[in-house]
């Protein structure tokens, strides 16, 4: 059994790597454009050139290609407090990422924020922060783990998970309850 | 006492457009951006779209560009999300909410607004 290519493979698999199959003629290869350029003009016949020209300031290609536009350059998300680590040139996209003693939180595939790292506090860090993951902490006695914060077991209710950390000071406050009752 | 109320939704053929809309009080709407999220039955929440508090910078997922539109109007204190050209997979309970700060999880949000997309 042949595996399904969609038309565009079938077509770049006709010709030698690093060319591509004329649109008009498929017994032409043409050879595809450097990185930084793209696709002006197919080549007029076998073993001429494709008239490639350079991306315009504002557009890349990161790869040999047959495309006849540039791509557009990202733009680095301020309102998710994204800084630019390095800026677009004709043959690469620009590169956006966090401040220092910060990490970035994927919201999905494309499009993270940038958030300041857990200092612990009331705690001991237990894994240092990285550039994908905050740090995780651990809590002193008398605290417990909320949303990556040393919270006092004083805001502990009874029908939250921090309870069992919490136990001895939740029955401590039971037992002042019950004594003020009598 | 913040509060988001989001209303718009409902049942829709394939193809067809709603328009929701987010009502925020309890805090300075025009220092926050704003998001719009969702949940498909069964399913966990889907970043949908966001606009800066200046409401020049937005962000759609990739399975809404092109269709969606989002907005806002600060003299109204309102948000906006334009659906166009839905599909089926666009059934889920429409969320907003302030674009987080201090870490990743909404501190506010209202009930949601149902989008069902059916034939």
């Known amino acids: 059994l042949v595996p399904h290519l969609g038309d565009r493979e079938k077509r770049d698999s006709v010709c030698p790597q690093g060319k591509y199959i004329h649109p008009q003629n498929n017994s032409i290869c043409c050879t595809k454009c450097h990185k930084g350029t793209y696709l002006y003009n197919d080549c007029p016949g076998p073993g001429q050139d494709t008239d490639c020209r350079e991306c315009e300031s504002g557009s890349f290609t990161a790869s040999e290609n047959h495309l006849r536009h540039c791509l557009s350059c990202s733009k680095c998300r301020k309102e998710m407090g994204q800084v630019e680590i390095s800026s677009c040139t004709v043959d690469r996209d620009t590169v956006c990422g966090c401040r220092k003693n910060q990490y970035r939180h994927y919201w999905s595939e494309n499009l993270f924020q940038c958030f300041n790292c857990s200092l612990c506090l009331n705690g001991t860090v237990h894994l240092s922060c990285q550039e994908k993951q905050n740090t995780v902490c651990t809590c002193h006695a008398g605290f417990f783990l909320r949303e990556n914060e040393c919270v006092s077991c004083s805001n502990c209710k009874k029908s939250l998970e921090c309870t069992k950390l919490c136990l001895p000071q939740i029955e401590n406050v039971k037992g002042t309850e019950d004594s003020g009752t009598t | 006492e913040v509060q988001l109320l989001e209303s718009g939704g409902g049942m829709v053929q394939p193809g067809g457009s709603l328009r929701l809309s987010c009502a925020a009080s309890?805090?300075?709407?025009?220092?926050?951006?704003m998001v719009w999220v969702r949940q498909a039955p069964g399913k966990g929440l889907e970043w949908v779209s966001h606009?800066?508090?200046?409401?020049?910078?937005?962000y759609y997922a990739d399975s809404v560009k092109g269709r969606f539109t989002i907005s806002r109007d600060n003299s109204k204190n309102t948000l906006y999300l334009q659906m166009n050209s839905l599909r089926a997979e666009d059934t889920a309970v429409y969320y907003c909410?302030?674009?987080?700060?201090?870490?990743?999880?909404?501190?506010?949000w209202g009930q949601g607004t149902l989008v069902t997309v059916s034939s």
């Open positions: 309890g805090f300075t709407f025009e220092h926050e951006g």
């Open positions: 909410a302030n674009i987080p700060k201090a870490g990743p999880s909404f501190d506010y």
């Open positions: 606009i800066g508090e200046d409401g020049q910078s937005t």
